[in-house]
């Protein structure tokens, strides 16, 4: 168990043309707050895909009104950390997305309005236990830096807080095969649930379900002695009483490396082979800058010769995000029809036909219903030797298998303006309008029945979060 | 055609408790998002709380904390359960509906409630 913490240090304008309109104004002040989702492993998920490694909401920032005529500058930012606590262990890869969200604080009924400003997304690999690691990432025109770390919460230790610390029994040392807890050396490791039979007095874990033997026993349980003619000791003295020892603590052990960082033993010592964006001996220091080589397949690095200076990484084709580290997919254009699995060979698109179709995008429908199901819980309907599914909530297209679009069916009442969000769908109401649909007018002309939008006003023009 | 019929309106006294009743002729009603407003004598009328169809809530700033909005959709009702009632929420009260279907709103004919020692 332990805490991701991330700290913003600023979120405004980013370096370069275009810079964004100030979101607060005389008539309208308002204030940021940030959202962070957390998902573990490096694999390119859906933005719509949950929070498994946690989320958190920040407290928000000052209020903030701009001032006529001068430049937009960094927003007033709220206290304080962002803890997400994880109660497994740290997988040591992640994604994130960082959400900057402005609470508009006009006079308007039923309390403050809110809308979605930048939202930043990225894969990283993170030890716990290391140092603050620093970031800085671009939407649009805006650009948000921050810095963020992964601890352990005790008694759990180690870089994926895996490993567990309990306060010494005896003021000396600690029991067989339970090593002191550094940094916390007044406390010792406590015994895991080692493998079932594992012995008491020669055996000891350091994962789950593992036995590891202490010095002069071996066996799966470690309830066998070492006999002295079969030893042979890479590191560590002999010992005449016990015949040959366990290795000794090598320089790797316990992995020096921070953030990441691979170690390898040398001869005097060790080496840390470090992730892009870290440096030092033991990978501790973080401050992407060009040189650090930020920018992954191909892309081109530009600007940022220190490291409180911006970096901008121009994509190859093919790939996109702040690092380059995004494959474009060709096959989210869903070229291929009636359910064919898309794949995306670099050179070329190929279309998988499911049973019962052809064609290079599956367009040829070579039966009906007969050995066929529809997806998702839908179900077939037979007719003029073609087949229909009639999908579940949620799913649509021919066979049910794509996600149905949420804003498709326009779920926003009143003009609202409709958003896919990661925890679903958003509407931004347009002024005059309340409700997660935006379905209640907040003062009605009388009964009568309203115009969708009031005299005016284009539809979903003010982007309203209610 | 979507017909509400409210009740529960009356005279309490200041910081007393009320709960105003709206049943719904359509027996869809949790496909309905339905609100309570209420017109006080002179001044236009107001969105008191709203529940969505998918049952999220939304009150105005004067009344949350003290006024409750709840659907049965067996009953094919809302409530507003109205407590540490102020003089300033005398009102005739009237029930709402925005039928997702027709995308049309829907009035009942309302409720007086009047606060006053």
């Known amino acids: 168990a332990g805490v991701f913490e991330l700290q913003i240090h600023s979120f405004g304008p980013g370096p370069g043309p275009g810079a964004p309109r100030s979101p607060c104004s005389a008539r309208l002040p308002c204030r940021l707050f940030f959202r962070v989702c957390l998902k573990p492993g490096l694999s390119e998920e859906a933005a719509e895909s949950p929070c498994a490694l946690g989320a958190a909401l920040s407290a928000r920032g000052p209020v903030y009104t701009e001032q006529p005529g001068a430049p937009a500058p960094d927003l007033p930012l709220p206290d304080g950390l962002l803890q997400v606590p994880f109660r497994d262990a740290w997988p040591g890869t992640f994604s994130f997305i960082i959400e900057t969200w402005r609470e508009e604080l006009g006079d308007q009924i039923g309390g403050p309005a809110w809308s979605l400003l930048a939202r930043v997304a990225g894969r990283r690999r993170l030890a716990a236990g290391g140092p603050w690691a620093r970031d800085i990432q671009r939407a649009g025109a805006w650009e948000l830096r921050f810095s963020y770390r992964a601890r352990c919460e005790p008694p759990a230790v180690g870089t994926a807080c895996t490993r567990l610390c309990r306060p010494r029994s005896a003021p000396s040392r600690c029991g067989p095969g339970l090593r002191p807890c550094a940094p916390l050396e007044d406390e010792c490791e406590a015994p895991l649930v080692c493998r079932a039979g594992c012995s008491p007095e020669h055996g000891f874990c350091e994962q789950p379900g593992e036995c590891r033997c202490l010095e002069g026993w071996t066996g799966p349980l470690c309830t066998v002695p070492v006999s002295t003619s079969s030893c042979l000791s890479p590191r560590g003295p002999s010992s005449a009483t016990t015949g040959c020892l366990v290795p000794g603590p090598g320089p790797c052990d316990g992995n020096p490396c921070a953030n990441g960082g691979s170690c390898s033993e040398t001869p005097r010592s060790f080496e840390c082979t470090c992730p892009r964006g870290f440096y030092g001996l033991r990978c501790e220091v973080s401050g992407v800058t060009c040189a650090d080589g930020p920018c992954f397949n191909g892309g081109l690095c530009v600007g940022g010769a220190d490291p409180d200076s911006a970096y901008i990484c121009h994509c190859p084709p093919g790939f996109q995000g702040s690092n380059c580290e995004k494959r474009v997919d060709r096959c989210s254009l869903q070229p291929c029809r009636n359910g064919g699995l898309c794949l995306d060979l670099g050179h070329a698109l190929r279309c998988r036909c499911r049973a019962g179709f052809a064609g290079p995008r599956c367009e040829h429908d070579l039966d009906d219903c007969a050995g066929r199901a529809c997806a998702n819980g839908g179900t077939c309907v037979e007719g003029g030797g073609a087949h229909r599914c009639s999908c579940a909530l949620g799913f649509g297209g021919r066979d049910c298998r794509e996600r149905a679009d949420p804003c498709a069916a326009r779920p926003c009442a009143h003009g609202g303006r409709c958003y896919a969000h990661f925890s679903g769908l958003v509407c931004a109401c347009a002024p005059g309008y309340m409700g997660a649909r935006c379905e209640f007018p907040v003062h009605p002309d009388g009964a009568s029945a309203l115009p969708a939008a009031p005299p005016g006003l284009r539809p979903g023009d003010p982007q309203r979060y209610l | 055609e979507v017909q509400l019929v409210e009740s529960g309106g009356g005279l309490v006294q200041p910081g007393g408790s009320l709960t105003l009743s709206c049943a719904a002729s359509d027996s869809v009603v949790k496909f309905l998002s339905m609100a309570w407003y209420r017109q006080a004598p002179g001044k236009k009328r107001e969105l008191v709380a709203g529940?969505?169809?998918?049952?999220?809530?939304t009150y105005m700033e004067s009344v949350k904390g003290r006024f409750t909005i709840s659907r049965d959709n067996a009953k094919n009702s809302v409530y507003l359960q109205m407590n540490s009632l102020r003089a300033e929420d005398t009102a005739v009260y009237y029930c709402?509906?925005?039928?997702?279907?027709?995308?049309?709103?829907?009035w009942g004919q309302g409720t007086l409630v009047t606060v006053s020692s």
């Open positions: 529940i969505s169809a998918n049952g999220s809530r």
């Open positions: 709402y509906a925005y039928r997702w279907a027709t995308r049309l709103p829907y």
